[in-house]
């Protein structure tokens, strides 16, 4: 079992990594958040059945503070919400327009985490002279996963635990008491 | 599952260094802050510092300062501990431990014995 | 450095008992306090952190309270396995430091 992916147990409440609910369509019509994988392109011809690879799905991006006990972080953080449907889906007829309109059948895809990164926060708690941090596991990007009838519900879930990968870079070092710097929950085995 | 596994018990003779490793498996080291805790026998509980494997960013206790070094290699997830100028005080159980925080010990390895003594 | 003091240093109970550790502070901690096991030659446990929200598995008879420079770990009802040193941990200033252990046996 896992860190519950460095569970949050921030008054802020963020579902576990790979148990998003669906955003809110609020969320989903605000353009300047959401952002298409495949830059809005359709998969090729319509008809073509493609491997998963073709698809993708929507990454809903959004900001939120890190909470841990009094302290906040000093930053918000950005964070991806894996949303919407995945293909491969098939034209199919519409029986009232005689058009052609696009619905999912066959196996199920969902939208889900593909990628973790670790992001180190500086809290600001009040009094407690020592700085603290703590680092968030945020979702990096999303991927559409075929799931069989064998794969329901639990192999999503396995995500939340999949080994983070974190971006390349410095962050920045703000720390405590040290010659280099000027300033400063996977489930318990009980 | 996350798992923490230390280097064999170690004997030194005073002012000898002595260098404690400690395996991270079921996350990435990158991912944590590494801590190091020490029990002399008999004794309570003395943190010595942490460290932040991804940007090398460490945090001593001013008793250890100078003494001691904590390094990590985040390619094979080990963190290691090394602490200089020994002193028959120095022996005790060395323990690492894991977390997402500066300030709590989440996971912790079995314990690394190091005896001090001519 | 902020000292931890842990009282008792050790007590007797049977399974079953209510049983009550405190930890006092030299100077005001706010709720920046942690709570760890030790059994016998294992390392120890994280129980309980900022002093009262238990940590992920462990069971609801540990309760923790307090603020500023006094605190109280409780076991509603001592189980079998519970009997083991007990300390409490501040980070409010670096260095961060432990109390002396409570020591849990059987009566």
């Known amino acids: 079992q896992g860190w519950q992916a460095f569970k949050n147990d921030a008054t802020e409440i963020i579902p576990e990594l790979g148990e998003y609910p669906e955003p809110p369509p609020e969320l989903e019509n605000n353009k300047t958040m959401n952002r298409a994988e495949n830059g809005g392109r359709p998969p090729h011809h319509p008809f073509e059945t493609k491997d998963v690879s073709e698809y993708s799905c929507r990454e809903l991006h959004f900001t939120r503070y890190v909470t841990d006990g009094p302290c906040r972080s000093a930053k918000p953080v950005t964070e991806l919400v894996c949303s919407g449907q995945c293909g491969p889906a098939r034209l199919l007829p519409n029986a009232i327009g005689r058009g052609k309109w696009w619905r999912p059948s066959g196996p199920d895809f969902r939208c889900i985490p593909d990628r973790y990164r670790a992001q180190r926060v500086q809290l600001l708690c009040p009094g407690g002279e020592a700085p603290r941090a703590r680092k968030v596991r945020l979702v990096a990007s999303c991927k559409c996963k075929r799931l069989t009838r064998f794969h329901n519900q639990s192999e999503l879930k396995d995500f939340g635990t999949e080994a983070a990968r974190p971006q390349k870079g410095r962050k920045p070092r703000p720390r405590a008491r040290s010659a280099k710097a000027n300033q400063a929950e996977l489930e318990n085995a009980y | 599952q996350v798992q923490l596994v230390q280097s064999g018990a170690e004997v030194k003779k005073p002012g000898a260094s002595v260098k404690v490793s400690c395996k991270v498996s079921?996350?990435?080291?990158?991912?944590?802050?590494q801590h190091w805790v020490r029990q002399a026998p008999g004794k309570g509980l003395e943190w010595m510092g942490w460290?932040?494997?991804?940007?090398?960013?460490?945090e001593y206790a001013s008793k250890f300062q100078g003494r001691v070094t904590m390094t990590e290699d985040t390619s094979t997830d080990t963190a290691y501990m090394e602490l200089s100028s020994l002193r028959s005080e120095d022996t005790a159980v060395y323990y690492c431990?894991?977390?997402?925080?500066?300030?709590?010990?989440?996971?912790w390895g079995q314990g690394t014995t190091v005896t001090v003594s001519s | 450095d902020i000292q931890m003091t842990q009282s008792p240093s050790s007590l007797s109970a049977s399974v079953g008992d209510r049983v009550t550790i405190t930890c006092r502070a030299s100077?005001?901690?706010?709720?920046?306090l942690n709570w760890y096991q030790q059994k016998p030659g294992k390392a120890p446990k994280l129980l309980i952190y900022?002093?009262?929200t238990r940590w992920t598995g462990v069971p609801s008879r540990f309760s923790g309270s307090g603020s500023g420079t006094d605190f109280t770990l409780t076991i509603s009802s001592l189980q079998p396995e519970d009997f083991a040193t007990y300390y409490c941990?501040?980070?409010?200033?670096?260095?961060?430091?432990f109390g002396g252990g409570t020591k849990v046996e059987i009566k």
């Open positions: 100077q005001d901690i706010s709720n920046y």
């Open positions: 431990a894991t977390g997402d925080t500066t300030y709590k010990f989440d996971f």
């Open positions: 900022w002093a009262s």
């Open positions: 460290s932040d494997p991804e940007i090398g960013d460490t």
């Open positions: 079921g996350f990435p080291i990158k991912d944590t802050f």
């Open positions: 941990q501040q980070y409010s200033d670096y260095p961060w430091t």
